[in-house]
Interface confidence: medium
């Protein structure tokens, strides 16, 4: 599983006039890290965990980050022309990734009233744009607003992927939390289903880094895939993740099935409660 | 009609702790985006931002001033307070406290003065 | 701390002239830099939020340009009653600081 962060950034234009605040927010691996504070003009921390990643600052370099990239998104926004009356909003979306054979990848997308109109994969400098005209239109704009910018501030995508990508191992390098091995706790339950059946439920929590094997097995075999069902693994909130796996299995055959767990090298078993 | 009043003691002998007060109507600490700052300026001199409470009571101090500082609020009376330990004679200054939503200070008070002497 | 510079200290006009007040941070602070102006024996008065947006009761004389780190301060046509001492804010990064403050003076 990769190491990301991902930027979402949103300004709103109310009457055709560009508002002076904007919205943002910062996940680092999946999980909320960062957002901006409208009100205090502050980036917080998201929870104890983003705290722990940042350390003992005053995270004025996340604020002057997200601030600049508001201010760049707010002129982007006054460059569109089809302001109509009303309120409307652009949205920005950049994602930067490290893999694991230190190979990276970055996107960036737009988005106006919620809809996609405009992608870049920044290491090929491919532009994406969905089929329809509005879409088109946009895309043309902000494209030729972004290319005029760059010029004048001879700036390009790649500098402001080369930036995310800076603060990404930034947060890697510093940070013992995010090269920190926690090891999931386990809980089986079951629940009656049908007569005859019950439904046993495997969930791994509090575990990091995300990538789990969670399976259940019967005689010590995997069971097919398509006879079971899985929970997303979802960040908690606390800067681990969680996920569940469930299977439905006949009344009195529990002692046959286990639910098998992988993590970070680690594995066991854990039996139905009888 | 928004209005801020400080009040405090005048006069103070050095070491002494400064007790400022306040009173604000026409808005609500309890309105989420809410806070009020204190803000002082010594007699012919420049602006000095000193600390700040939130609605949701978190508080923001400027650093080369945070220890001697502590900031309150008591939401239902409307009030702000700012003590500051052990003062000396370079903390002779007009203090303003004043309201701060959107990132500036849109609403002042009419200041109090404060003169520290032995 | 980020660093608030205002320029000149002192500036002296004649009514009816158009002025410009200087103000740079040292380093950027985006557009999240305000205005206000301190009449004598007067509390501070909001005139500018976020370098060039005008503020409800302010006279249209007065108006903000600027971005990053370099930010002015313009009356239009400076009229007698706007002697006083402007001073530009940063509100981008903690702690908030304040300019030392230019003196509009009339001759």
């Known amino acids: 599983e990769p190491h990301s962060l991902r930027y979402n950034l949103t300004v709103l234009s109310w009457d055709g006039s560009v508002q002076s605040g904007f919205l943002a927010e910062v996940h680092l691996d999946g999980q909320p890290f960062l957002r901006y504070d409208r009100q205090k003009c502050r980036a917080k921390p998201q929870g104890q965990w983003a705290e722990d990643v940042l350390g003992n600052k005053t995270w004025d370099r996340e604020t002057r980050d997200l601030t600049g990239n508001g201010k760049d998104l707010r002129m982007t926004l006054a460059h569109i022309k089809d302001q109509k009356e009303g309120l409307h909003s652009l949205q920005e979306i950049r994602v930067c990734e490290i893999h694991e054979d230190n190979s990276t990848r970055s996107s960036q997308h737009f988005y106006y009233d919620g809809e996609l109109f405009l992608s870049q994969n920044v290491e090929t400098e491919e532009w994406t744009v969905p089929q329809s005209s509005r879409a088109q239109t946009l895309a043309m704009n902000v494209r030729n607003f972004l290319k005029e910018d760059a010029m004048k501030t001879k700036t390009h995508y790649h500098a402001m992927h080369a930036d995310c990508l800076q603060e990404l191992r930034r947060y890697l390098e510093s940070s013992v939390v995010l090269r920190r091995r926690v090891p999931p706790m386990v809980n089986v339950t079951r629940s009656e289903a049908s007569e005859g059946n019950i439904t046993v439920t495997c969930r791994a929590s509090s575990f990091y880094p995300r990538n789990i094997t969670l399976t259940w097995r019967q005689d010590g075999v995997s069971l097919s895939h398509d006879t079971q069902q899985w929970g997303d693994v979802l960040p908690d909130g606390n800067g681990t993740y969680q996920t569940w796996v469930a299977t439905r299995i006949c009344q009195g055959e529990e002692q046959r099935f286990t639910c098998y767990m992988e993590h970070s090298g680690n594995h066991s078993t854990h039996p139905v409660p009888s | 009609q928004i209005t801020l009043k400080e009040s405090g003691p005048g006069i103070l002998k050095p070491s002494q702790t400064l007790s400022l007060t306040c009173s604000f109507s026409g808005f609500s600490l309890s309105t989420s985006g809410m806070g009020v700052g204190w803000i002082r300026q010594p007699s012919g001199k420049g602006l000095e931002w000193l600390a700040h409470?939130?609605?949701?009571?978190?508080?923001y101090y400027n650093p080369s001033l945070k220890s001697q500082l502590t900031i309150s609020k008591d939401t239902s009376r409307n009030q702000v307070f700012l003590r500051i330990t052990s003062v000396d004679t370079a903390d002779t200054a007009t203090y303003y406290c004043?309201?701060?939503?959107?990132?500036?200070?849109?609403?002042w008070g009419q200041g109090t003065t404060l003169t520290v002497s032995s | 701390d980020i660093v608030m510079t205002q320029s000149p200290a002192t500036l002296s006009v004649t009514p009816g002239d158009r002025v410009s007040l200087s103000c740079r941070a040292s380093q950027s602070i985006s557009d999240y830099l305000h205005w206000y102006q301190q009449k004598s024996h007067e509390s501070p008065r909001l005139l500018i939020k976020y370098a060039s947006q005008s503020i409800s009761g302010i006279p249209s004389r007065f108006s903000g340009s600027g971005s990053g780190s370099d930010f002015t301060l313009s009356i239009n046509s400076v009229e007698p009653e706007d002697v006083g001492v402007y001073y530009c804010q940063n509100g981008h990064s903690f702690p908030w600081t304040f300019g030392g403050g230019t003196k509009l003076e009339i001759k």
């Open positions: 409470i939130w609605w949701d009571d978190d508080k």
């Open positions: 004043a309201r701060r939503t959107q990132g500036y200070f849109d609403y």
